[in-house]
Interface confidence: medium
């Protein structure tokens, strides 16, 4: 018959906040200052993120979790975990290579971040434009033209929306 035995990795006993120190006979050593391990069984600790410059600290680093950053006023986060900080613009604008620029006609941005998006095309839903769009606000769609009382007029709807990924230049 074949006898099997399981050899447990001694490092698996090292909890979060420690690392398995090969230089000390695989003893669980605490993470050094400014480092952390968020899971058990780690052979190294990760260096804590430092929130410098336009980044500011939202959550301090601990032995078991990384620091979390956000952005100083006038900037906003981009990407996962606030990878980058980007300058705010005004509503009705978007950030371009040449700085903040007004949204092109037919597009809007109701926030200080992000890009100008096309006005809703009310006619795609068989509706009419009840309130015109602006650089800061989308159009408001109302009842379909057929539902309007005689003599009522509707504004000509804007051009169809862009495909995903495009931005007005």
């Amino acid at each position: 018959f074949e006898r099997t035995r399981s050899l447990q990795d001694p490092c698996s006993n090292c909890p979060a906040g420690t690392f398995c120190d090969n230089n000390r006979n695989q003893i669980c050593s605490p993470c050094p200052p400014n480092s952390f391990s968020s899971a058990g069984g780690q052979r190294t600790c990760d260096i804590c993120r430092q929130c410098k410059g336009v980044f500011r600290t939202r959550k301090e680093c601990s032995s078991t979790s990384n620091a979390e950053c956000d952005c100083t006023p006038g900037f906003h986060c981009l990407g996962a975990g606030c990878s980058m900080c980007e300058q705010d613009c005004k509503q009705g604008q978007e950030l371009t290579k040449k700085g903040c620029k007004d949204c092109c006609f037919g597009t809007f941005n109701d926030q200080k971040r992000g890009i100008c998006r096309p006005w809703t095309n009310c006619s795609l839903d068989g509706k009419s434009v009840l309130v015109n769009g602006t650089k800061e606000r989308d159009v408001v769609c109302g009842p379909s033209p057929a539902d309007l009382s005689p003599g009522a007029s509707s504004v000509t709807p804007p051009a169809p929306a862009r495909e995903p990924g495009h931005s007005p230049q």
């Epitope: 971040r113 992000g114 890009i115 990924g165 495009h166």
Partner: nanobody, 115 residues
Amino acid sequence: QVQLVESGGGLVQPGGSLRLSCSASGDIFSIMFWYRQAPGKQREYVSHITSNGRTNYADSVTGRFTISRDNSKNTLYLQMNSLRAEDTAVYYCAADDATNTRTYWGQGTLVTVSS
């Protein structure tokens, strides 16, 4: 439904080149990113490009990697030159929605740099 699908990963020798692609659908994206995660390491930022062409790179890839975007095809690219062993990782495409309030992720493509 938002979908980001990466392709172009593979095995390459040190000093070689690869071009990664990411096909995007389902939303308007203000910014698209490349991140990477090496075995046993934290995920790290590589590069991003905005819808109007502004780009940025991590220090470790500056001068070697080039990000680009074809808005007509809704596709993101990463041209990787002078590859090093330390570039070995799963490379992820990510994208922020038009309001920079949500980040979407692809499934990743493995790049292995080895002789």
